[in-house]
Interface confidence: medium
């Protein structure tokens, strides 16, 4: 679990001729706000696919009214961070979509209207817990400057927020009646101690004794602004949070990317993201071939290798479009029977069945179990016009009337002895082994090579298998 954070520093007309004077034009007063959408992975998914990692809207900005004949001012922006909580692991690679919307405040039939001013899409790699990354993007005639980061929350740590740690003061096991949760590290690792005097505001460290500076700061302790003028006019997070994230003239100023490419700053250089059909350091090369990997979502590219030869993408099931960029609506074929609800999960179709029906496509009528009895606590499971019983532990056969020996399959490894038990089986492990099925060797010092024994159990103790 964690939070993706986005800070918009500025949004306004980009450099060069033809820049718009106002976001509101002749429509009357308006106010700006931003929407961020996160999708996992680096694939170019269909635009309408959901923001699977999450989405967030900013607050509405102040009302803006165009002043005739006045120079185009900085546009008033909403305050604060945009925060997108994520529930599961941070994927590391993701697509970031930032949209700038304007809300038209004049009278509208059917309520307020929003119109999209600009949309930028970046495919990025980002580890959780790292410093702020900064970017400058152009969308049409508009320029957007922003910073972003991912950070873990609650007890999560690590670059994907998947390792859980327990505060030193917390109890070391789960409460009564509870199974151990996801594996917790016994103690939270302390963050590394940075070099003495390293700026808390502008420096950080990943190894003990080092002092690495956020962009815009320099010096052995990150206390010297990289450029004394670089933060003038910066609208964004305070230097207490991020240092100076958008210094003055940078590699992307003047946009070195041709043919509508968008520019991202990298340490000491820049990177162009090119529109489809162009590639090269500055998007200066046209004529896409299969060598450029134009087919997304696992599509197979067929075509000549020379620049004059067109290519064709053969799309895998579930995708379509000239570049396999669109997801097929497989539910339109209505695969779920008996009124089931179809869900396209991407990797598979799932049918949610109405009461009384079951099966992958809701094809089975559960009435087959009517009047059928399964003995000894078994439950009836419908199966294509017949029924079968799912038996409780210790019983088997068509109607669960036969006793089954849970030890018959020799479940205890490494010479452990199996005992039948009313709720399953118990393994008594041979010396040197532990675990519910004696599967883990014990080191000579008494520490297991794999998961530790639950509290209260010593290596070699019988352990009940639940």
């Amino acid at each position: 679990a964690g939070v993706f954070e986005l800070q918009i520093h500025s949004f306004g007309p980009g450099p060069g001729p033809g820049a718009p004077r106002s976001p509101c034009s002749a429509r009357g007063p308006c106010r700006l706000f931003f929407r961020v959408c996160l999708k996992p992975g680096l694939s170019e998914e269909a635009a309408e696919s959901p923001c699977a990692l999450g989405a967030a809207l900013s607050a509405r900005g102040p009302v803006y009214t165009e002043q005739p004949e006045a120079p185009a001012p900085d546009l008033p922006l909403p305050n604060g961070l945009l925060q997108v909580p994520f529930r599961d692991a941070w994927p590391g690679t993701f697509s970031l979509i930032i949209e700038t919307w304007r809300e038209e405040l004049g009278d509208q039939i059917g309520g307020p209207a929003w119109s999209l001013l600009a949309r930028v899409t970046r495919r990025r790699r980002l580890a959780a817990g790292g410093p702020w990354a900064r970017d400058i993007q152009r969308a049409g005639a508009w320029e957007l400057r922003f910073s972003y980061r991912a950070r873990c929350e609650l007890l999560a740590v690590g670059t994907a927020c998947t390792r859980l740690c327990r505060p030193r003061s917390a109890p070391s096991r789960c409460g009564p009646g509870l199974r151990p949760c996801a594996p917790l590290e016994d103690e939270c690792e302390a963050p590394p101690v940075c070099r003495a005097g390293c700026s808390l505001e502008h420096g950080f460290c990943e190894q003990p004794g080092e002092c690495r500076c956020l962009e815009g700061w320099t010096g052995p302790l990150c206390t010297v602004p990289a450029s004394t003028s670089s933060c003038l006019g910066l609208r964004g997070p305070s230097s207490a949070t991020t240092g100076c994230l958008v210094p003055g003239p940078g590699p992307c100023d003047g946009n070195p990317c041709a043919n509508g490419g968008s520019c991202s700053e990298t340490p000491g250089s820049f990177e162009c993201t090119c529109p489809r059909g162009f590639y090269g350091l500055r998007c200066e090369v046209s004529g896409v071939t299969c060598a450029d990997g134009p087919c997304f979502n696992g599509g197979l590219c067929v075509g000549g290798a020379d620049p004059d030869s067109a290519y064709i993408c053969h799309c895998p099931p579930g995708f379509q479009g000239s570049n396999c960029e669109k997801r097929v609506d497989r539910c339109s074929l209505q695969p779920c029977r008996n009124g089931g609800l179809c869900l396209d999960l991407g990797h598979a179709l799932r049918c949610r069945c109405r009461a009384g029906f079951a099966g992958p496509r809701c094809e089975h009528n559960l009435d087959d179990c009517a009047g059928r009895a399964c003995a000894n606590g078994g439950t009836c499971v419908e199966g294509g016009g017949a029924h079968r019983c799912s038996c409780a532990l210790g019983f088997g056969g068509r109607d669960c009337r036969e006793r089954a020996d849970p030890c018959a399959a020799r479940p205890c490894a490494h010479g452990g002895r199996c005992y039948a038990h009313f709720s399953g089986l118990v393994c008594a492990c041979a010396p040197g082994y532990m675990g519910s099925r004696c599967e883990f060797p014990v080191h000579p010092d008494g520490v297991s090579a794999l998961p530790a024994a639950p509290p209260g159990l010593r290596p070699g103790d019988p352990q009940r298998y639940l």
Epitope: S49, C51, R60, E99, W101, G110, W114, L116
Partner: nanobody, 129 residues
Framework: QVHLVESGGGSVQAGGSLRLSCAAS????????MGWFRQTPGKEREGVAT????????YYADSVKGRFTISHNNAKNTIYLQMNSLKPEDTAMYYC??????????????????????WGQGTQVTVSS
């Protein structure tokens, strides 16, 4: 998927009050907006009130401004519609919806159904004179 379950509908005399609730479950972090729409037989579904569940900005149809209040409890993933000074013309099936601006469009109306991908089953509100 996002699942929405409405409650709180019923019958009331004109001038009375009702409070509708809508509980959301599932991938609620994928949606930006939740709201209430209503529909009477033979007519199109119309927006009543919507709320940006992130920062709390609200939108109301002109016909309910000053009488209805939409609110949300993010911790419970629930939105509410407090309906006061009810009129017979408020009689309708009220639907809870969740969604937001699509990532493939350039225009959106917070009080119109397009863009709301997830809908509840509806709860009936009847106001008698």
């Amino acid at each position: 998927q996002v699942h929405l379950v409405e409650s709180g509908g019923g019958s009331v005399q004109a001038g009375g009050s009702l409070r509708l609730s809508c509980a959301a479950s599932g991938y609620t972090y994928r949606v930006n907006f939740m709201g209430w729409f209503r529909q009477t037989p033979g007519k199109e579904r119309e927006g009543v009130a919507t709320i940006d569940s992130g920062v709390g900005t609200t939108y109301y149809a002109d016909s309910v401004k000053g009488r209805f209040t939409i609110s949300h409890n993010n911790a419970k993933n629930t939105i509410y519609l407090q309906m006061n000074s009810l009129k017979p013309e408020d009689t309708a099936m009220y639907y809870c919806a969740a969604g937001g601006p699509p990532t493939d469009g350039d225009r959106w109306y917070p009080l119109r159904p397009p863009g709301y991908n997830y809908w509840g089953q509806g709860t009936q509100v009847t106001v008698s004179s």
